[in-house]
Every structure is written in C-alpha cells, then in structure tokens.
Amino acid sequence: CKAMHVAQPAVVLASSRGIASFVCEYASPGKATEVRVTVLRQADSQVTEVCAATYMMGNELTFLDDSICTGTSSGNQVNLTIQGLRAMDTGLYICKVELMYPPPYYLGIGNGTQIYVIDPEPCPDSDF
C-alpha cells in the first residue's frame, strides 16, 4: 500500500487558558529525512491553514515566530500545541503530514481532532 496513514485523537478539550494539545502520528512508508506538518481547520467545506512546520528527522519542529502553534517530534510522532484559542475556534483540526524528501513524496491526512474551546467565565467583581 502506497498510502500514508495519519492518526490523531478524535476529541480534545482546550484548557481554560485556551491551549489544546494533541499527538499526530504517521506510519511512514519510506525513510523520510524532511517532513512538513500542517494543522488545518475545517469548517463546513472550507479548509484553512492554522500553522505549518518543516523539520528534519531527529530535529525539532520549527514554526514561524508569530505562529499560534508549537510542537516537538519524536520519530514518527509529533506533539502539537495550539495556543490562544477562543470558543469561536471550536472545530475540526486536521493534521497533514508530507514526506518531502527523499523521493518519493507522500501525503498523509488525518481524520481530524474536534477541539472544544470554552471561554472562561469572567471573575465576578469583589465587594470587599
């Protein structure tokens, strides 16, 4: 089989600080040295890029400085963290993995992780 399987949790609940973490694991059909990981958000039929990082196997993921994502890698497993989430960001987050080098190129698309974000209740004013 030439397809690359990508596994990710079905559901994740963001913390009260708007941080959600999940693992994206891929079964590599080849021995890749350069991998690109992208987090996509799917709302209805619209798919948008949340963040992306390219890394050399054995090295750390490097997201852009202004990215809302951070992550670490270990073998064929990537630990992703998305920060600054609000209730309106609740949705399906898809992990996309591309084995860029060496040839052949492989694409792997996860089924998506439904991230639920609940905005914290504002603290009531104290009457002391």
Partner: antibody, heavy 118, light 108 residues
Framework: EVQLVESGGGLVKPGGSLRLSCAAS????????MHWVRQAPGKGLEWVSF????????YYADSVKGRFTISRDNAKNSLYLQMNSLRAEDTAVYYC???????????WGQGTMVTVSS | EIVLTQSPATLSLSPGERATLSCRAS???????LAWYQQKPGQAPRLLIY???SRATGIPDRFSGSGSGTDFTLTISRLEPEDFAVYYC?????????FGQGTKVEIK
Amino acid sequence: EVQLVESGGGLVKPGGSLRLSCAASGFTFSSYTMHWVRQAPGKGLEWVSFISYDGNYKYYADSVKGRFTISRDNAKNSLYLQMNSLRAEDTAVYYCARGGHLGPFDLWGQGTMVTVSS
Amino acid sequence: EIVLTQSPATLSLSPGERATLSCRASQSVGSSYLAWYQQKPGQAPRLLIYGASSRATGIPDRFSGSGSGTDFTLTISRLEPEDFAVYYCQQYGSSPWTFGQGTKVEIK
C-alpha cells in the same frame, strides 16, 4: 478573485526551449504546493512536475526529467516551467494547478498551448 | 507508480439517466487520496470529488464518489445536459501523481 493564469506558450522547433509562467492571485501563494499538468491534443491528463511551498523540493515525470525545470517566486506569486530540448511529443496544452490543502488539484489555470514542430 | 484504469472508455446515456464510472488502481490507494475531475472541451479540468467521496465546493449533490483500496466509483444520479464531458480519476497520495485515461460521457 482566486485564479491562475498561464502564459508563454507558442510554436518552437524540436530541440528548442520555452519558458512558461503562471501568475497566481487571490490566495496566499506560498501556502500551497504547485504543479504543472499537460494534455496532448485529443489525449488525457499527464502530470509533469511538482514544487514544494518554498521551492526547495521538486519532482518530475520520467518523460521530462533532465529537460524541464520547475521554479517559483513567492514574492511575485509566480510559477515557472523552463522547457529545454523540446520534442514533438511535448506538444500539449500546459496547465498550472494548485495542490489544495487536502491534496487534490483544486484550482487550475486556463492552459497555454505549446507546439513543437519543424 | 500507481496506474489508474478507468472504465468504460465511453458511456452513452440520455439526460436523466444514471451514470456509473469506475476507476481501478494497480495498488491500494488510501481513500483520502483519490479525486475525480470533470473536463469539457476547450476548458481546464474542474475538481469534483476529493478524498474518494467528498464533494468540492459548488459541486451539485447529484455527483457522488465511493470506494476504497483499489476500486473507486463516480456516480452521477441524474445526468443534466451540462454533465456530458470527460471524467478523470487521480491519485495524489504519493509521487508520481497519476491520472486515469478518462471516461467520456456522451449523449446517446
């Protein structure tokens, strides 16, 4: 408007060269992989070449390897295909296509005709 | 290289009829990586179905895709006059990206 517009096609003699361009607009060009696909007259679609987001990685069909070179300029939102040592069998309509976020070619240009004949 | 074989080469049907197009892969293709395109004369291809069964934006629900592994199907439930065209399947899970040879749906 989200679109791709190819240019640079024309008539060229066997052994000659041609450079195709594809101008992208209406989307963040650097966030997508790009491809060239061709279609010989009356024939089906044939994938020609792929280029990664930053242009670091390129793949080619065996039929054009060593003769064609794909490149991109993200600052200019442009994709290119340099075609050298052209043969009669390279005669085709050449399309640039966007590799969508989920993989399929979700946006195509209108195509540019390349004719290789003496 | 994954070879895609489409059948039949030509399908002659009348408007209102159901069209069933087949695409068979030489080796297993993950269902997430199979697409269908429509092409009309003088026009660029248009994405219809991706991930074997998901309709692209703006595609009418009379188009549906199914299948997994090596066998995939595109179904047009009731042919409209504008549906007569050539249809291609494609795998995009690994390089080289490959297309089937196409099925022409023509008016009977």
